[in-house]
Amino acid sequence: IWELKKDVYVVELDWYPDAPGEMVVLTCDTPEEDGITWTLDQSSEVLGSGKTLTIQVKEFGDAGQYTCHKGGEVLSHSLLLLHKKEDGIWSTDILKDQKEPKNKTFLRCEAKNYSGRFTCWWLTTISTDLTFSVKSSRGSSDPQGVTCGAATLSAERVRGDNKEYEYSVECQEDSACPAAEESLPIEVMVDAVHKLKYENYTSSFFIRDIIKPDPPKNLQLKPLKNSRQVEVSWEYPDTWSTPHSYFSLTFCVQVQGKSKREKKDRVFTDKTSATVICRKNASISVRAQDRYYSSSWSEWASVPCS
Amino acid sequence: RNLPVATPDPGMFPCLHHSQNLLRAVSNMLQKARQTLEFYPCTSEEIDHEDITKDKTSTVEACLPLELTKNESCLNSRETSFITNGSCLASRKTSFMMALCLSSIYEDLKMYQVEFKTMNAKLLMDPKRQIFLDQNMLAVIDELMQALNFNSETVPQKSSLEEPDFYKTKIKLCILLHAFRIRAVTIDRVMSYLNAS
């Protein structure tokens, strides 16, 4: 058993049929010595008396808010949560496996630049009685500070018969130099509590590996005389690290119709303009990637050909 | 300890091309190592990230773009003095700071070159003959060093009398390649910045 926060405790249980469970001793936070009784949740049934209560925690029915009273007055609470371990593996029932970039990916994180700011998100099908708490640091043995905000519900989607909820959190490394060469990864820890179930999820990464620039901005077309070719120009996204001559991007320019299976014109360039062949009912799209360290491409910025 | 904006004329900057070749060569070599040593811990997640130049050179700080010198987190207190001549410094206008930056890059390359050559000598003794360093990568390091053209004492190649542990050598190769790739990215950014200034 360990303390998650004040008056909230996590009991770690090996979860298998007829498991013996864990013996837990609760102590009432009071100077009083006698006349103390214990109840669980909203029940008025007295579970025991005395300053301490010893319980055998085996299942979710044994978890919950234990309260000690004296003469009708509440003295203190202890909330017990369960953390299940099945076949030596901690449960991951609360969050959905995003399977990208690999299996067992519950947290995904992205950074728009090298400023030390990043966003992580996760998915669940659970809609109520759900809380998240996020901590982060650079390195684990001698951790350096990363400050995370509160996790918020950022999107809701319908997937078949199920509703899927996306939560996200923004974090900022306390003293980040965009030009630094990272040698210690960022660690992100998410505590998830659903009713009386506790789970924790972690992710470890270098900012350089989660970079995904915003799409290029201000796409403009200039038709070339006596030709089917069009000059397309654009600018670096505002959120990208500066100076741009140091943090350079490379671009992919594509002309394609509505269907992905349609024919296309595609060219890669380090410049902020390119010449392509425009077709009726097609769109010109441009995306960006760090020129020197190949992490993710940005989403496409598009303009119609016509 | 930063790069001023008044740097050489773009046409006078021969190191950009060499630095691009360097990044390409080390990336290819790292990819080859990952594939060949698939049963060794050789991915970014599996290895310890070590920097053999730590406390010996200060490339990131010495080559910091002017725009980032206002960022206190970028200003490390490490001071290192370097020899200040070189053919990438294509004009007399070139500041002492830029010379410091380029000589720091030169020292990085020299250190990695020695490590890679020592390692290659060990790998050549491996009866499995599983992996060797790409001669192209070694040649590209050499070309960039020549383009930088700094006078500096030669670092003797480390020779070891004991029987090499090939497993450890291959893991060290992965660690070195990962670190060198990160440094090659920094070098490429620096050269691009200098070329554009």
């Epitope: 089917r228 070719q229 490379t250 299976r261 349609e262 024919k263 296309k264 014109d265 595609r266 060219v267 890669f268 360039t269 380090d270 010449t275 062949i277 077709r279 009726k280 | -």
Partner: antibody
């Protein structure tokens, strides 16, 4: 399986024209760009131009502009390349090639040898 | 027009050994570079697109690298069927242009 089958070898006199055909099978004809390139004996490849069979749009290499015409007949899934004012240096194997990507070629015809000789 | 220069023009290699072919562009072409294999009397066959992207059905011993002006096609271990002429082609701008070819011969 996508295939491009070209017409047979031709012998032409200087000053005349030649029209080489390229019949496509497998896949929808208008879903691909179709290009023509040529290779003179012992020489490298030379790109001549492309056509979008969907709308008849064409683009030619400046070297051949005014002398080459590329057309396409969607009903027969056939593309044609006509080269006029032939000279002896036009002696080459002419290839058609196609791709959904405009700028490179993933399927090629077998080639047609055009000999220009007096 | 962008001029593509291949080297060497002829490359003698022992079967089973690796081979590297170089292609240089007269100006920067990013990664807009494609590699083909051509055997005598046959049409070219696409091996690599955009400098390093493998093509389905092409053996994994063929790999490409490079960007800007310098590109390399590598065959990790030459098989008897790999002895042929290899061509590079730029797609950075029209007109599309090819290298003059590198003939890989049995040593």
């Amino acid at each position: 399986q996508v295939q491009l089958v070209q017409s047979g070898a031709e012998v032409k006199k200087p000053g005349s024209s030649v029209k080489v055909s390229c019949k496509a099978s497998g896949g929808t004809f208008s879903d691909y760009y179709l290009h023509w390139s040529r290779q003179a004996p012992g020489q490298g490849l030379e790109w001549m131009g492309w056509i979008d069979p969907e709308n008849g749009d064409t683009e030619y290499a400046p070297k051949f502009q005014g002398r080459v015409t590329i057309t396409a007949d969607e009903s027969t899934s056939t593309a044609y390349m006509e080269l006029s004012s032939l000279r002896s240096e036009d002696t080459a194997v002419y290839y058609c090639a196609r791709n959904k990507e405009l700028r490179y070629f993933d399927v090629w015809g077998q080639g047609t040898l055009v000999t220009v000789s007096s | 027009d962008i001029v593509m220069t291949q080297s060497p023009l002829s490359l003698p290699v022992t079967p089973g050994e690796p081979a590297s072919i170089s292609c240089r562009a007269s100006q920067s072409i990013s990664i807009n570079l494609h590699w083909y294999q051509q055997k005598p009397g046959q049409a070219p066959r696409l091996l690599i697109a955009f400098a390093s992207q493998s093509i389905s059905g092409v053996p994994s011993r063929f790999s490409g690298s490079g960007s800007g002006t310098d590109f390399t096609l590598t065959i990790s271990s030459l098989q008897p069927e790999d002895f042929a002429t290899y061509l590079c082609q730029q797609s950075n701008s029209f007109p599309l242009t090819f290298g003059q070819g590198t003939k890989v011969e049995i040593k």
